[in-house]
């Protein structure tokens, strides 16, 4: 029962994750105008990794996307691939977790199986994660460095007489959606990656075959204590099939050819 | 035809209020922000006030915060300045106008003003 | 707050010249987010409130004769009337859109000789 709840969890924390990060993605407001010098601004600029933001007071926005590929600057290329590298990870991951399910059968799927599919898209969700989070923290660190060297040469002046404000730019939105995404994306992984330990066959179990020793009527069963146990007094939610019997969440052997369910 | 008329003229005395109010007509109210402005008896142009389409912001020229508030109904489509502890520099023609949907924050359409004398 | 100067105070002219007006402004009203100039250009005739005559420094407002135009960047802007016509007899204001406290220039008065 833990390992399907912790698979499920992992499924269900990733996929809001997931979610997250291609919200975070094709929001506008990556980086906003600082407000700190002039807190009531006519105009109001944002900016997003794909098209920049004005909005007047008057009530109007007019967005313009970068139409250039080339003129863009290298680091935000660096974080849009870091964000697609994310989402088509994490999209991969989520489609491989669905058919990872324990609650979920499809055919005679091998339990290992399940187990190599919960631990890829455990992987998946954890680079997706780490990629999101590398791309908001390489577009924060990018807007720091900016925003120091815009206060800098905040005001430039003309013969000490007329001042050029330049637009200051501070956190945006999308930066803390993206972090705590990312972060969301990489706890479904890691917790995609601890159910797929409970998943995974400890020991093959082989069909129980009963050596007479003489004089004595001892039944010898390979596998030691994890395999007796399935005979001793736990009978809660026992399968029987042939060649053994376990229960739904303790660790599983392969089915045999002839499983079907 | 857009119509912006406003009214609550009148002689007070300092440190005395008054509220004025601006109908509209002739356009969706709701979309659009309003703000008040001010000419002075000089014909000087002086910003008083700002709000938003919503009401949601509500900026102030520094003369006029903290004496003069703006406010708006939607459903009646009207716009009000509701101004107290008046100064004789406060006397001015007092002009409702809105801004501009698309195009910086121009103000496209002005009321004929209504005139306010703090004179004691 | 941004200083709007306007030059010269009045201006005398005859029908059908060609007339230039200056304002200036404290502060760079040039927005890097789309690259507009927020300034614009205010028409006042007598007895009769303010009409907008170009916005974002150089967009003339709809119904506004060609003969006005705009332009300028930052902080230097003009307005010209390529050919003066008696009904163009007013006081011509700039302001700052750029940032509150939205602020007027001291005006042009437009006189006939």
């Known amino acids: 029962m833990a390992v399907t709840a912790c698979q499920g969890l992992g499924f269900v924390v990733s996929l809001i994750g997931i979610a997250g990060i291609i919200a975070a993605t094709c929001m506008d407001q990556w980086s906003t105008q600082d407000l700190y010098n002039n807190p009531v601004t006519a105009v109001f600029n944002y900016q997003g990794l794909w098209r920049s933001c004005v909005r007047e007071s008057s009530g109007f926005t007019e967005c313009r996307g970068y139409f250039t590929l080339l003129g863009l600057p290298a680091m935000l290329q660096a974080v849009r691939a870091l964000m697609i590298v994310g989402i088509v990870l994490g999209a991969i991951g989520l489609l491989v977790s669905i058919f990872a399910l324990k609650c979920i059968r499809i055919g005679s799927m091998e339990d290992s199986a399940k187990a190599n599919m919960t631990l890829t898209s455990g992987i998946m969700f954890i680079v997706s994660g780490l990629c999101a989070i590398a791309g908001v923290s390489v577009f924060a660190n990018m807007l720091v460095t900016n925003f120091w060297m815009s206060t800098a040469n905040m005001y430039t002046g003309m013969g000490g007489m007329v001042q050029t404000v330049q637009t200051r730019y501070t956190f945006g939105a999308a930066l803390f959606v993206g972090w705590v995404a990312g972060g969301l994306t990489l706890i479904g992984g890691v917790m995609m990656c601890i159910a797929c330990r409970g998943l995974a066959p400890e020991e093959t179990n082989y069909k129980a075959v009963s050596y007479h020793a003489s004089g004595h009527s001892v039944a010898y069963k390979p596998g030691g204590f994890k395999a007796s146990t399935g005979f001793g007094s736990n009978t809660k939610n026992k399968k029987i099939y042939d060649g053994g019997a376990r229960t739904e969440d303790e660790v599983q052997s392969y089915p045999s050819k002839h499983d079907y369910v | 035809d857009v119509k912006l008329v406003e009214s609550g003229e009148g002689l007070v005395k300092p440190g005395g209020s008054l509220k004025l109010s601006c109908a509209a007509a002739?356009?969706?109210?709701?979309?659009?922000?309003m703000s008040w402005v001010r000419q002075t008896p000089e014909k000087r142009l002086e910003w008083v006030a700002y709000i938003s389409s919503g009401g949601d912001y509500i900026y102030y020229a520094d003369t006029v915060k903290g004496r003069f508030t703006i406010s708006r109904d939607n459903a009646r489509n009207t716009l009000y300045l509701q101004m107290s502890s008046l100064k004789s520099e406060d006397t001015a023609m007092y002009y409702c106008s809105r801004l501009r949907l698309r195009g910086g924050n121009a103000m496209d359409y002005w009321g004929q003003g209504t005139s306010v004398t703090v004179s004691s | 707050d941004i200083v709007m100067t306007q030059s010269p105070s009045s201006l005398t002219v005859t029908a059908g010249e060609k007339v230039t007006m200056s304002c200036k402004s404290s502060?760079?009203?040039?927005?890097?987010?789309?690259?507009?100039?927020?300034l614009t250009w205010y028409q006042q005739k007598p007895g009769q409130p303010p009409k907008l005559l170009i916005y974002w420094a150089s967009t003339r407002e709809s119904g506004v004769p060609d003969r006005f135009t705009g332009s300028g960047s930052g902080t230097d802007f003009t307005l010209t009337i390529s050919s003066v016509q008696a009904e163009d007899l007013a006081v011509y204001y700039c302001q700052n859109d750029y940032a509150y406290p939205l602020t007027f220039g001291t005006g042009t008065k437009l006189e006939l000789k």
């Open positions: 002739g356009f969706t109210f709701s979309s659009y922000a």
């Open positions: 502060q760079s009203l040039l927005n890097s987010g789309n690259q507009k100039n927020y």
